[in-house]
Interface confidence: low
Amino acid sequence: MKVSAALLCLLLIAATFIPQGLAQPDAINAPVTCCYNFTNRKISVQRLASYRRITSSKCPKEAVIFKTIVAKEICADPKQKWVQDSMDHLDKQTQTPKT
């Protein structure tokens, strides 16, 4: 299958914006983001804006992707206690409307 130079250039540019530890499979498939390694550092909940779970069978491992307040995305291991605590905290924040 031929790929035009413009498309190839576009793909290369897009690749530079994929966060560290994250990868996206071939665009022919449905877009899925996977984590291939986890942060080995606890992230303070004060710095977190949101999270999403990665459970797709297309990915090598289950993961949580935290988005920080400055839009940086970080892969974390959902089996670690601090990750569970952080998800709980963000869930509570979402449930409690700010007055």
């Epitope: 606890k42 992230i43 303070s44 004060q46 710095r47 940086k72 206690k81 605590d85």
Partner: antibody
């Protein structure tokens, strides 16, 4: 750091902390105090952009933390001062990691004495 | 808010090893990073350990930080004690309400 001194209970005082040697607008900043012969007590934090401010319960509603990026200066406006506010006040730079709150650079401290 | 509890004072002879504990009253010690500060008399605090067990550049490897989930505490261990290590040591962490928490401080005397 400047602005410390002797003040009567109920009065106000404003502390200043002039920062240099780093990009002030990129870092969160804290105020931490230490009463005579006592331990360190966190007072307040302001985030790098000035949009988020948090206070210890003991000063909430009386103290206001602020910053002026154009002057590279951190402030602590202290109102309704009490005898128990007597302490050395330190400004401290936040580590400003994504990962935790901590202090990595400290000012030399300024003394506030609240006494009638 | 949780509290961080430290021994009021510890003492040891030069050349020996001393450990200062910092116990978290509620919540997991492993959920948030712990920092350790040294404060010599009449001086501002300086960081000796950050992120549980990391040493800033310039801090000798005689200073070692760790956390122990079973006792829900952090520890600062100083080996090969020197007279200049005599100071107050404070642990510090933070909670999910954007509050910073300090331990009460431990006075280290090098006999």
């Amino acid at each position: 750091q400047s602005g410390g001194g002797v003040v009567q209970p109920g009065r106000s005082l404003r502390l200043s902390c002039a920062a240099s040697g780093f990009t002030f607008s990129s870092y969160g900043m804290h105020w931490v105090r230490q009463a005579p012969g006592k331990g360190l007590e966190w007072v307040a934090v302001i985030w790098y952009d000035g949009n988020n401010k948090y206070y210890a319960d003991s000063v909430k509603g009386r103290f206001t933390i602020s910053r002026d990026t154009s002057k590279n200066t951190l402030y602590l406006q202290m109102n309704s001062l009490r005898a128990e506010d007597t302490a050395v006040y330190y400004c401290a730079r936040d580590s400003s990691s994504y990962y935790y709150y901590g202090m990595d650079v400290w000012g030399q401290g300024t003394t506030v004495t609240v006494s009638s | 808010n949780f509290m961080l509890t430290q021994p009021h004072s510890v003492s040891e002879s030069p050349g020996k090893t001393v450990t200062i504990s910092c116990t978290r009253s509620s919540g997991s010690i492993a959920s948030n990073y712990v920092q350790w500060f040294q404060q010599r008399p009449g001086s501002s605090p300086t960081t000796v350990i950050y992120e549980d067990d990391q040493r800033p550049s310039g801090v000798p490897d005689r200073f070692c930080g760790s956390i122990d989930s079973s006792s829900n505490s952090a520890s600062l261990t100083i080996s090969g004690l020197r007279t200049e290590d005599e100071a107050d040591y404070y642990c510090q962490s933070y909670d999910s309400s954007n509050h910073v928490v300090f331990g009460g401080g431990t006075k280290l005397t090098v006999l």
